[in-house]
């Protein structure tokens, strides 16, 4: 359904708001370092040419693709060059080369300042004055700090975030009403962040199909009862709108988004009884209810897997006829009745499965060589099942912050070279699987810890991306998707690696650290531990462990002190010289 | 009592299409392969072809393209849409029940009483 | 895929010991993926046999199937009045597009 102008479709599609909000992002995603005010004076013109081709899909320069649009709109920023560097050699690009160079250019860890949450009374101020303002200005900071954040969906996190205000500044107690709500929008959307991130990462570094197994393997888990056809169509929809969204495609994105949610909805007969509710709301809430809705219940008398798939005479000629759609059909009907089982975990059987069906249908007796694969997915399926009741264990013996500490020890022996924010970061959110997923019984454990691993140890792979240190952390991240979580598991302590320089600055601490929450308070605590383990990545747990309850209560007591600050310089030395003579640094 | 009733079939005219259904009783549709076989007054047995407990169609090379096998394992039955019917597709149409779950083993072990089609102007 | 049996009629008595064979144009899957049925007129066929040589439930004993590959062999050891009927070899072969029957030996009273 080819149009006469790409921008004027788009602008009638989403309607003014959206497509002001969507553009912003856009922007904000590929400019990170540009001021908000120049953000929103390129949106508007962008939304002033929008207009006039609305009015005329023939006036000039219409008919071009939003790509050149934006592309050409992004390159008239004057400080491109001293801001941004070799980003500035984009522009001298033609499209698709300019929008790729763009992409490429996006940075996962900008170096922004931490945003900091004024006081309730200022942001109420704020959100009354110019309520628009405000809202663009959550678009903007988010945006850019989150480059490939899913479009949509920051458009439902925005109208949240203004519903917040909107009820809360009213209230008697505002920080009361509002402080929670924001914790909650702040929390939700890191993770809905990183979630996008592994989409995206899917499809930029392993390929469409990487993404759509993931797809089929999903939406079969949520839709157990749709049809086969039905969960294919689906996927190649899905397919298509997180191409867009991770291509920057954000209008083109937010448009099929929303197509979808409305196809769902139309036939949510065949494909879910669990819909009805996401179907009734707004747009915005249906397509985030829809992507968030529980499975549904299994047909009563699915048949057994293997009649089709080992015992059949046919599988080498269905496989050779469709290969990917054969395959397709196996991890569809492998996923609906595994509910219980992680997306990943599906992967790799699919993936042990293609394998054994390549090497098999080529031998002189397929069947009797292929006979026992099913066997073959027995110690895959208990790997991860023993890796989470182990840690879930420990996880429940030791707690959310001593379970974090363990995970810091364990991945800084294993990969030392990596930078001590990146690690300690990336263990914390490890970290957090036990009291997201642990509560949960048996048959949902593992879809939750797994996946949701994958998406913490994504955020480690393009972290590290950006500045490799690691040729371990490159290979378990680049080798193959669905092992990274089995890769990293499986590394030892790194033997190669050289201890780290003793520096007392590292362990110097002052009185500050005494009014940070207690958030913060560990994030230091924590930072110190990574450190200690690459000065002496040989200490033991209980080495480590002395030396980590010294430093608590040597926290603990000068913040406690009159003289705060002279408790932390005298304390302080003495706590690293028995630090460093218990490790024998 | 586990039994498998076909119905649909009749006259139709030539160029014309019909879909026979074949409900089973007494057991679960979903465990094993179904086929349909048929035989034209007099003549053999021809098989037709068969789908898969997990929905894979299998057909003679002679039905390819005209005939298509379907199930509704919620409503315990198969079917069978043929189209483009032609004189010599007059035959009592049987729906059986095969010994394995995945292919055509050859084996059918329960058959229905069949329905006669008849294709004529 | 031809079936061929042979021979396509045959009369005999009660008490005869009787032999029916089936020819494939190529091997049946496993060397053993064939089927005998019988059937008699107005009714639906019953499976005999499967696998060339395995006794279908509820069959009696003086049926009997041998034969491997492409050669295969119904007997009827001791003829009874009920075994009056058409008698068709079905084979599955390595795609289930290809199973075939074959035309039938019609078995009639002397």
């Known amino acids: 359904d080819a149009h006469k102008s790409e921008v004027a479709h788009r602008f009638k599609d989403l309607g003014e708001e959206n497509f002001k909000a969507l553009v912003l992002i856009a922007f904000a995603q590929y400019l990170q370092q540009c001021p908000f005010e120049d953000h929103v004076k390129l949106v508007n013109e962008v939304t002033e040419f929008a207009k006039t081709c609305v009015a005329d899909e023939s006036a000039e320069n219409c008919d071009k693709s939003l790509h050149t649009l934006f592309g050409d709109k992004l390159c008239t920023v004057a400080t491109l060059r001293e801001t941004y560097g070799e980003m500035a050699d984009c522009c001298a690009k033609q499209e698709p080369e300019r929008n790729e160079c763009f992409l490429q250019h996006k940075d996962d860890n900008p170096n922004l300042p931490r945003l900091v949450r004024p006081e309730v009374d200022v942001m109420c101020t704020a959100f009354h004055d110019n309520e628009e303002t405000f809202l663009k200005k959550y678009l903007y900071e988010i945006a850019r700090r989150h480059p490939y954040f899913y479009a949509p969906e920051l458009l439902f996190f925005a109208k949240r975030y203004k519903a917040a205000f909107t009820e809360c500044c009213q209230a008697a107690d505002k920080a009361a009403c509002l402080l929670p709500k924001l914790d909650e929008l702040r929390d939700e959307g890191k993770a809905s962040s990183a979630k996008q991130r592994l989409k995206c990462a899917s499809l930029q570094k392993f390929g469409e199909r990487a993404f759509k197994a993931w797809a089929v393997a999903r939406l079969s888990q949520r839709f157990p009862k749709a049809e086969f056809a039905e969960v294919s169509k689906l996927v190649t929809d899905l397919t298509k709108v997180h191409t867009e969204c991770c291509h920057g495609d954000l209008l083109e994105c937010a448009d099929d988004r929303a197509d979808l949610a409305k196809y769902i909805c139309e036939n949510q007969d065949s494909i879910s009884s669990k819909l009805k509710e996401c179907c009734e709301k707004p747009l915005l809430e249906k397509s985030h209810c829809i992507a968030e809705v529980e499975n549904d219940e299994m047909p009563a008398d699915l048949p057994s897997l293997a009649a089709d798939f080992v015992e059949s005479k046919d599988v080498c000629k269905n496989y050779a006829e469709a290969k990917d759609v054969f395959l397709g059909m196996f991890l569809y009907e492998y996923a609906r009745r595994h509910p219980d089982y992680s997306v990943v975990l599906l992967l790799r059987l699919a993936k042990t499965y293609e394998t054994t069906l390549e090497k098999c249908c080529a031998a002189a007796d397929p069947h009797e060589c292929y006979a026992k694969v099913f066997d073959e997915f027995k110690p895959l399926v208990e790997e991860p099942q023993n890796l989470i009741k182990q840690n879930c264990e420990l996880f429940e013996q030791l707690g959310e912050y001593k379970f974090q500490n363990a995970l810091l020890v364990r991945y800084t022996k294993k990969v030392p070279q990596v930078s001590t924010p990146t690690l300690v970061e990336v263990s914390r959110n490890l970290g957090k699987v036990g009291s997201k997923c642990c509560k949960h019984p048996e048959a949902k454990r593992m879809p939750c810890a797994e996946d949701y691993l994958s998406v913490v140890l994504n955020q480690l792979c393009v972290l590290h991306e950006k500045t490799p240190v690691s040729d371990r952390v490159t290979k378990c991240c680049t080798e193959s998707l669905v092992n990274r979580r089995p890769c990293f598991s499986a590394l030892e302590v790194d033997e190669t690696y050289v201890p780290k320089e003793f520096n007392a600055e590292t362990f110097t601490f002052h009185a500050d650290i005494c009014t940070l929450s207690e958030k913060e308070r560990q994030i230091k605590k924590q930072t110190a531990l990574v450190e200690l383990v690459k000065h002496k990545p040989k200490a033991t747990k209980e080495q480590l462990k002395a030396v980590m309850d010294d430093f608590a209560a040597f926290v603990e007591k000068c913040c406690k002190a009159d003289d705060k600050e002279t408790c932390f310089a005298e304390e302080g030395k003495k706590l690293v010289a028995a630090s460093q003579a218990a490790l024998g640094l | 009592e586990v039994q498998l009733v076909e119905s649909g079939g009749g006259l139709v005219q030539p160029g014309g299409s019909l879909r026979l259904s074949c409900a089973a009783s007494g057991f679960s549709l979903s465990s094993n392969a179904m086929g349909w076989v048929r035989q034209a007054p007099g003549k053999c047995l021809e098989y037709i072809g068969i789908i898969s407990v997990g929905g894979f169609t299998y057909y003679a090379s002679w039905a390819k393209g005209r005939f298509t096998i379907s199930r509704d394992n919620s409503k315990n039955t198969v079917y069978l849409q043929m189209n483009s019917l032609r004189a010599e597709d007059t035959a009592t149409y049987f729906c059986a029940r095969d010994r394995h779950g995945g292919d055509s083993s050859g084996a059918f072990y329960l058959w229905g009483q069949g329905t006669l089609v008849t294709v004529s102007s | 895929i031809q079936m061929t049996q042979s021979p396509s009629s045959l009369s005999a008595s009660v008490g005869d010991r009787v032999t029916i064979t089936c020819q494939s144009s190529?091997?049946?899957?496993?060397?053993?993926?064939l089927s005998w049925y019988q059937q008699k007129p107005g009714q639906p066929p019953k499976l005999l046999i499967y696998?060339?040589?395995d006794l279908a439930s509820g069959v009696p004993s003086r049926f009997s199937g041998s034969g491997s590959g492409t050669d295969f062999t119904l007997t009827i050891s001791s003829l009874q009045p009920e075994d009056f009927a058409t008698y068709y070899c079905?084979?599955?072969?390595?795609?289930?597009?290809?199973?075939?029957f074959g035309c039938g030996t019609k078995l009639t009273v002397l």
């Open positions: 079905a084979g599955g072969f390595s795609s289930s597009s290809d199973t075939a």
């Open positions: 190529e091997s049946v899957y496993s060397n053993n993926q």
């Open positions: 696998d060339a040589s």
